[in-house]
Interface confidence: medium
């Protein structure tokens, strides 16, 4: 299993969440929210809705080595990964399922997608869950905008992502009580922060690629994904 994602990997996780396309078959999985930030110990709800006609629903945590968190099928005892046993509740039916993950830990930070088992497997658009230490809650915000299609996430690999030494999360935004004159500065800093996040994400990715086989699919795919994500700051996504 991949090692637990760190908050230092936020730029990469954000790129993943933004880069994941929604269901692209006739049957779709509607998934919400797209992104949520919660403190350690809190709970989060992820809802997966389909038009029916499925065998069951998996919730998969994405990353270099995807991991199935739960399997839910009406009338069957749900299967839960050992990491989450005793921390997961379900409500609704497999067609409209709400999965509640409790007592979240920093290591639970990641992108989660619903996988509906149908004639053609379909996938939700992904939920980026950011688990933060309580005192840093103001540092990490995510806008709940729909993800945009991009290059593939990395296929599974045998190695955990190394902890990048140079990456950092988005900078602390200015206080809400700042003077209106500071709005321009805020906008500038926000743009700068996003740009820095992209640069840092690429730095992390290059580290990962130099650390692993440079010819591997995972390496090139992470590069592609990061690049297209950064480009979306100023131009339409090339894969939409």
């Amino acid at each position: 299993m991949a090692g637990p994602p760190r908050l230092l990997l936020l730029p990469l996780l954000l790129a993943l969440a933004r880069g994941l396309p929604g269901a692209l078959a006739a049957q779709e999985v509607q998934q919400s929210p797209h992104c949520t930030t919660v403190p350690v110990g809190a709970s989060v709800n992820i809802t997966c809705s389909t038009s029916g006609g499925l065998r069951g629903i998996y919730l998969r945590q994405l990353g270099p080595q995807p991991q199935d968190i739960i399997y839910y099928e009406d009338g069957v005892v749900p299967t839960t990964d050992r990491r989450f046993r005793g921390r997961i509740d379900f409500s609704g039916s497999q067609d409209n399922l709400t999965i509640t993950m409790h007592r979240l830990q920093l290591s639970d930070t990641g992108t989660y997608t619903c996988q509906a088992i149908t004639e053609v497997n379909v996938y939700g658009s992904g939920t980026l869950v950011l688990v933060t230490e309580e005192q840093s809650q103001g540092w990490h915000r995510c806008s709940d905008a729909p993800p945009r299609a991009s290059a593939l996430p990395a296929p599974p690999t045998g190695s955990a992502l190394p902890d990048p030494q140079t990456a950092s999360a988005l900078p602390d935004p200015p206080a809400a009580s700042a003077l209106p004159a500071a709005l321009a500065v805020i906008s500038f800093l926000l743009g700068l922060g996003l740009g820095v996040a992209c640069v840092l994400a690429r730095t992390q990715i290059k580290k990962l690629c130099s650390w692993r086989d440079k010819n591997s699919a995972a390496c090139v795919v992470y590069e592609d994904m990061s690049h297209s994500r950064c480009n979306t700051l100023s131009s339409p996504n090339q894969y939409q």
Epitope: L20, L152, P153, P156
Partner: antibody, heavy 118, light 110 residues
Framework: SVEESGGRLVTPGTPLTLTCTVS????????MCWVRQAPGKGLEYIGI?????SAYYASWATGRFTISKTSTTVDLKISSPTTEDTATYFC????????????????WGPGTLVTVSS | DIVMTQTPASVSEPVGGTVTIKCQAS??????LSWYQQKPGQPPKLLIY???KLTFGVSSRFRGSGSGTEYTLTISDLECADAATYYC????????????FGGGTEVVVK
Amino acid sequence: SVEESGGRLVTPGTPLTLTCTVSGFSLSSFAMCWVRQAPGKGLEYIGIINTGGSAYYASWATGRFTISKTSTTVDLKISSPTTEDTATYFCARGNGYAGYGYDGFDPWGPGTLVTVSS
Amino acid sequence: DIVMTQTPASVSEPVGGTVTIKCQASQSITSWLSWYQQKPGQPPKLLIYAASKLTFGVSSRFRGSGSGTEYTLTISDLECADAATYYCQSNYGSSSAYGAFGGGTEVVVK
């Protein structure tokens, strides 16, 4: 659906391009792989092309095959066929999040037969 | 490169019996394995993916298990229609390991 075409009898060394035509889904959303099967033998994975157009090959296939795509087709070019390349060639769609094939490959085309003989 | 070793090469069992096919990877592929069924003159059909997930519409008589380097496909209550060749495939991520097939197992139903 998925369907291969372009298979025929060729002489050794004559380049050949096979085409996989897809319908009902978009190649910008799914990866596609090529697999071959020599008469009476097992399946042999050749390579895959992802949604962004990057191709990855089995080590034995690197340099011998080239995978490329358009909006509705995926091509497999055999640069210099030998008699050992005589086989039925299949293309298949990758399943998995964003269409990558870590959930296997399905559907498959019926295959197209390539015969390399002098 | 990864090597997928499938055993046995051939097996014969009566209707109603059980067949077990094993697939061994030369390195850990952490459950990223698919099983296919192929009948003469037809393309392969995906049965199981991620080692144990049954493809929609496939009978629950087919069961996949295993992790790491050792995987098993079990077919119970054999039917005549199960006569086919079965292949395992690595779906593990790096380009050197990705996609490799086992050599196949021919299942004969008596």
